[in-house]
Interface confidence: medium
């Protein structure tokens, strides 16, 4: 992996990539953009999927956290031969199918979609794309759009969560490299630490959850801290404060010494969760300690 900033968030990341005829001579730039970005998401709990669309949508690589499968998926991505129309909605449809299936299986993992396209969508195709993006959102996804060359920023702002979720690349495909850092910064939601990481059994505490991207939620009122206790019961708590780099949350009262609470964060009122390897444990505290 190359150096520089990385994302430690555990969520499901979908790349939805335009492989219509208009990108025929620029597929290498798209591929290298995805490859470099993919290598920056390094949590072992992060899963990734590659979806391409032209006249139909195809899932090149289903959701996986297996780094070898991701490497093979990138190889398949490099071999793609662009051609056909810009049926972006077909790409979103493939993502929604996977999100829907994962939800049905009981995996309520947060989903982030990064959709890349060039050119303007004709009215009915835009209609379907907006609708399918809304369907993905309805299933809990956060949607970002990358527009290259002749894109329509107003259209992409309606397909993405907001205008702030659109990354315009006005200087052509070669400029894609220049937005990797800003995409990473905006799309990364990560939990890095909890303070304190050890709490007293039977007592109430506030926990500061350190991380990034907590204000990327469409509505910060829907952010929740979630504590998965001893791998069984999950308790959700509304934070007292939501900042981009930290949350201030009431911790659940854990009655026994040695209990473990795995920390998760929901950006959508518990519909889905960002996972982490951050654990809060209980210890015995004598009076006055």
């Amino acid at each position: 992996e190359d150096g520089g900033p990385a994302c430690y968030g555990g969520f499901d990341l979908y790349f939805i990539l335009d492989k219509s005829g208009s990108v025929l001579h620029h597929w290498n730039e798209i591929y290298y953009f995805v490859e470099q970005l993919a290598h920056k998401f390094i949590s072992p709990q992060l899963r990734m999927s590659f979806i391409v669309f032209s006249t139909r949508g195809t899932t090149l690589m289903k959701l996986t956290e297996d780094r070898e499968q991701i490497r093979q998926g990138l190889e398949e991505l490099q071999k793609v031969l662009p051609g056909g129309d810009t049926y972006m909605h077909e790409g979103f449809e493939r993502a929604s199918e996977q999100i829907y299936y994962e939800n049905r299986q009981g995996y309520r993992t947060a989903s982030v979609i990064i959709a890349l396209t060039d050119g303007e969508l004709h009215e009915d195709l835009f209609f379907y794309s907006e609708r399918e993006a809304n369907r993905s959102r309805d299933l809990g996804a956060i949607v970002y759009c990358v527009g290259v060359k002749d894109f329509n920023e107003t259209q992409l702002a309606r397909i993405a969560d907001s205008k702030d979720h659109v990354f315009p690349v006005n200087d052509g495909f070669q400029a894609l490299q220049g937005i990797i850092h800003s995409i990473l910064k905006k799309s990364c939601i990560e939990i890095l630490a909890a303070e304190p990481s050890t709490i007293c059994a039977g007592e109430s505490f506030q926990v500061v959850v350190r991380g990034n991207g907590f204000r990327h939620a469409r509505n910060v009122d829907r952010v929740l801290c979630s504590f998965k206790i001893n791998d069984s019961v999950t308790l959700n708590e509304k934070p007292f404060s939501v900042e981009d780099t930290y949350l201030l949350c009431p911790a659940p009262i854990l009655k026994e010494v040695g209990m473990k609470a795995a920390l998760q964060v929901s950006m959508n009122d518990g519909l889905s969760f960002i996972s982490s390897s951050v654990i809060i444990t209980t210890t015995h505290c004598s009076d006055g300690s």
Epitope: E97, E123, F127, R131, N134, R135
Partner: antibody
Framework: EVQLQESGPGLVKPSETLSLTCTVT????????WNWVRQAPGQRLEWMGY???????YTNPSLKSRITINRDTSKNQFSLQLNSVTPEDTAVYYC????????????WGQGTTVTVSS | EIVMTQSPATLSVSPGERATLSCRAS??????LHWYQQKPGQAPRLLIY???QSISGIPARFSGSGSGTDFTLTISSLEPEDFAVYYC?????????FGGGTKVEIK
């Protein structure tokens, strides 16, 4: 509260043009999609077409080139024109809002009856 | 175009009983299926969207299920105001099409 109200003549002669207007209150036609749906006596509902928040239209191919949907954002109204009508176009005409978040028609006008007869 | 077929055409049920209405699409429409209620002289009213998602203000006795081509609207315990015609709608692809309706009448 969002309300839609259809208006226009209740009787149109065959081969003439049917013209209806839908006035929207409580929402702006510069957002979402604004539709016409009709229901002939004893028949199922038929989607006719929409005009989008940006002014683009999409219509049911079964109506071929007979249908035109326009809008007047200053009055927050959109309209339907159906050319070369026949008695088969006799129906209750509804305007309805469509939101892509539900992909459904979530608000409807109360409907206006149009009879095509000489 | 996608053809929507509803059955039965008429359903006779007593108040308090359960009513089950069916809708079939001529091709896979995933869960882009919506249910509407229409009373005489009134416009249709959206009851259920995306096959099973409830609309705020609609009583909990109305529920929907299904995916792909086969869908069901269930009214768990019929109230007098529920006797009406119910339509399903394909929301998947243009042109949007409706079923022929199921009339729920008092037995």
């Amino acid at each position: 509260e969002v309300q839609l109200q259809e208006s226009g003549p209740g009787l149109v002669k065959p081969s003439e043009t049917l013209s209806l207007t839908c006035t929207v209150t409580g929402d702006s036609i510069s957002s979402d999609y604004w539709n016409w749906v009709r229901q002939a006596p004893g028949q199922r509902l038929e989607w006719m077409g929409y005009i989008s928040y940006s002014g683009n239209t999409y219509t049911n191919p079964s109506l071929k080139s007979r249908i035109t949907i326009n809008r007047d954002t200053s009055k927050n109204q959109f309209s339907l024109q159906l050319n070369s009508v026949t008695p088969e176009d006799t129906a209750v005409y509804y305007c309805a809002r469509y939101k892509t978040i539900t992909s459904a028609f979530d608000v409807w006008g109360q409907g206006t009856t149009v009879t095509v007869s000489s | 175009e996608i053809v929507m077929t509803q059955s039965p055409a008429t359903l006779s049920v007593s108040p308090g009983e359960r009513a089950t209405l069916s809708c079939r699409a001529s091709q896979n429409i995933r869960d882009f299926l919506h249910w509407y209620q229409q009373k005489p002289g009134q416009a249709p009213r959206l009851l259920i969207y995306y096959a099973s998602q409830s609309i705020s203000g609609i009583p909990a006795r109305f529920s929907g299920s299904g995916s792909g081509t086969d869908f069901t609207l269930t009214i768990s315990s019929l109230e007098p105001e529920d006797f009406a015609v119910y339509y399903c709608q394909n929301g998947h692809s243009f042109p949007y099409t409706f079923g022929g309706g199921t009339k729920v009448e008092i037995k």
